[in-house]
């Protein structure tokens, strides 16, 4: 085959070698590109900035060598059109720093970048815990700062990342109010700082207010729905990143809705209770409490980890005539009390009525309209009902 | 696979009490009812108790009630059942055996008691 | 509380021989429980539900009956058979127990 004059020449059946001396200056309209898989660079002393739009459209790149080159400088946001990318060789430029944004979000099994006169500071702290870590081959290069030493050896001890605190309310929210938020933020070295909001959705109207080191938020006409849902934080340094999540009770009262008796390996009655704080439960049978027993009793589905509603069920092993009749599920909580109650029929009754035939659980009387009795439990009582608190 | 682990043999002299443990692998804790069920030497099966790890509702037999204390430690997915006030006719085999939607599906080793003075 | 009485207390069988115990209720309950247990060993669940099989049980253990009435049937003795059985009720608290019915080697 001839060989190739050009300053990019094909290399097997999706990589490009650029190797002719001083030929780039950037990585605009490189041959090809949509389809590389392999780029490598050599002798390239103008090539000085590695950006965004360099490596647009190199969607499918898995390997960049840039060597024995003039890069200088690499852009954060560099790679974000190449989340393919899993090979980095930057070896011998003019490198003295490259952020950790420039490689978050890769999953890189080899970083190179021996040869290159790295200035030793905070912002190099993620790239010597990759090193003390053992992470994309980084110790074997033995880094060096140019005039420092090792990298190893420098001193870290105040290369932290931003340090947030979120303040929330103490006092209850309720559905409605509006709710102000604030994220204090240091350390040194500030540079970004935010809010993540992706989660509220319809949950509340938001305002965002002052910036660093101190940033509001205000959720104004808070709806119940806000509640289990994350606000988040975040802020950046030239060491890392901080994120604190905070989530807001809006207290709202019990609700509960019975359905159906049906038959799931054995019976269950299902339900759904929702309040916040976490309803109490108590089951009623005709009229009496139900003491529930290790044959009929309260089980709760796995719960959504961002709403405060819980499904469950009144299971009821063994079901026969006896327990037959109308259950009630009582849910209360301190802003309000809510019940619902359903009609089961497990068995028709074999028998007559035979005075003797065991009542399968234990009842007490209770008034209906009263709320919820203490949760609390004594574990040498056999207590008088059964509460279980929800959440 | 679902195994109860019983704690050793214990001999105590009539009055005090005795604290038998049983610690669960192989399923969700939470989940089951943990029963206690003893046997005295040459007898039949008794009943003392059910507790439900998932919120600490314990049932207990009335014969038992005011000396046998059930209990759950659920970061470490055991169940304990305490008995006071030992007399020589406590002497027996302690179990403990799990249900969920089922009796007893599966049961402890067994933890012998011995009440001597 | 619902007390179980088994009959008989013991009995002397052969292998191969067809086996019923009967578990009769003080008062009615939906179904009936059984347990064989060897000695020095602990129960081990072998019908449910009066006559489900418990999973590694032979076929030839069944469970029938209703109200106060139940049995538990062998129809052909195995050597492993030769056991202690309880029969149990899961409707009432507290939980009850047959008293057992041995079952010994002719």
């Known amino acids: 085959a001839a060989p190739c004059p050009d300053a990019c020449c094909p290399h097997g059946s999706s990589g490009l070698r650029c190797t002719r001396d001083g030929a780039l200056d950037s990585l605009h309209h490189l041959p090809g590109a949509e389809n590389l898989t392999e780029l490598y660079i050599e002798n390239q002393q103008h090539l000085q900035h590695l950006e965004l739009r360099d490596l647009r459209g190199l969607g499918e790149l898995r390997n960049l060598t840039i060597v024995k080159s003039g890069l200088r400088f690499v852009a954060p946001d560099a790679f974000h059109f190449t989340p393919r990318l899993s090979r980095l060789n930057l070896s011998f430029n003019a490198l003295e720093s490259l952020s950790w944004k420039t490689v978050q979000g890769l999953s890189l099994q080899e970083l190179v970048l021996s040869g290159n006169p790295l200035h030793c500071s905070c912002a190099l702290r993620w790239l010597q815990r990759w090193e003390e870590e053992g992470l994309g081959g980084v110790p074997e290069q033995k880094l060096q700062c140019h005039g420092q030493g090792p990298l190893a050896h420098m001193p870290n001890a105040s290369c932290g990342v931003p340090t947030l605190k979120v303040q929330v309310p103490n006092a209850s929210v309720d559905v409605g109010d509006d709710v102000l938020l604030r994220c204090q933020v240091e350390g040194r070295g500030l540079e970004q700082a935010g809010w993540i909001l992706t989660e509220l959705e319809q949950s509340a109207t938001v305002m965002k207010s002052g910036g660093l080191p101190s940033l509001g938020l205000t959720l104004a006409n808070v709806t119940s729905d806000l509640n289990r849902k994350n606000v988040t934080c975040w802020a950046e340094n030239d060491v890392g990143r901080a994120e604190v999540s905070v989530q807001v009770n809006v207290s709202f009262p019990a609700s509960v809705q019975l359905h159906t008796a049906v038959e799931m390996h054995h019976w269950c009655i299902p339900f759904s209770v929702d309040g916040q704080p976490a309803p109490s439960l108590r089951w009623l049978f005709n009229g009496s409490v139900l003491n529930e027993t290790s044959f009929i009793f309260t089980e709760f589905l796995e719960p959504a980890a961002n709403e405060t509603v819980r499904h469950g069920c009144l299971r009821l092993n063994q079901p026969t005539h006896v327990n037959n009749g109308n259950y009630t599920l009582l849910a209360a909580n301190p802003f309000g009390q809510a019940s619902a109650s359903i009609m089961a029929a497990f068995m028709d009754n074999p028998f007559e009525f035979n005075p003797e035939d065991p009542i399968p659980v234990s009842f007490s009387p209770v008034d209906t309209n009263s709320t919820s009795g203490d949760p609390v439990e004594k574990k040498d009582e056999t207590p008088f009902g059964v509460s279980v608190a929800v959440g | 696979q679902v195994q109860l682990v019983q704690s050793g043999a214990e001999v105590k002299k009539p009055g005090a009490s005795v604290k038998v443990s049983c610690k669960s692998s192989?399923?969700?804790?939470?989940?089951?009812?943990m029963h206690w069920v003893r046997q005295a030497p040459g007898q039949g099966l008794e009943w003392m108790g059910e507790?439900?790890?998932?919120?600490?509702?314990?049932n207990y037999n009335e014969k038992f009630k005011n000396r046998v204390t059930m209990t759950v430690d659920i970061s470490i997915s055991t169940a304990y059942m305490e008995l006071s006030r030992l007399r020589s006719d406590d002497t027996a085999v302690y179990y403990c055996?799990?249900?969920?939607?089922?009796?007893?599906?599966?049961w402890g080793q067994g933890t012998t008691v011995t009440v001597s003075s | 509380q619902v007390q179980l009485t088994q009959s008989p207390s013991s009995l002397s069988a052969s292998v191969g021989d067809r086996v019923t115990i009967t578990c009769s209720a003080s008062?009615?309950?939906?179904?009936m429980h059984w347990y064989q247990q060897k000695p020095g060993k602990a129960p081990k669940r072998l019908i449910y539900?009066?006559?489900k099989l418990a999973s590694g049980v032979p076929s030839r253990f069944s469970g029938s009956g209703s109200g106060t009435d139940y049995t538990l049937t062998i129809s052909s003795l195995q050597p492993e058979d030769f056991a202690t059985y309880f029969c149990?009720?899961?409707?009432?608290?507290?939980?009850?127990f047959g008293q057992g019915t041995r079952l010994e080697i002719k």
């Open positions: 055996a799990r249900s969920r939607y089922d009796p007893m599906e599966d």
């Open positions: 192989g399923y969700t804790f939470t989940n089951y009812w």
């Open positions: 507790i439900y790890p998932n919120n600490g509702r314990v």
């Open positions: 008062s009615s309950v939906g179904y």
């Open positions: 539900d009066t006559s």
């Open positions: 149990q009720q899961w409707s009432s608290i507290p939980l009850t």
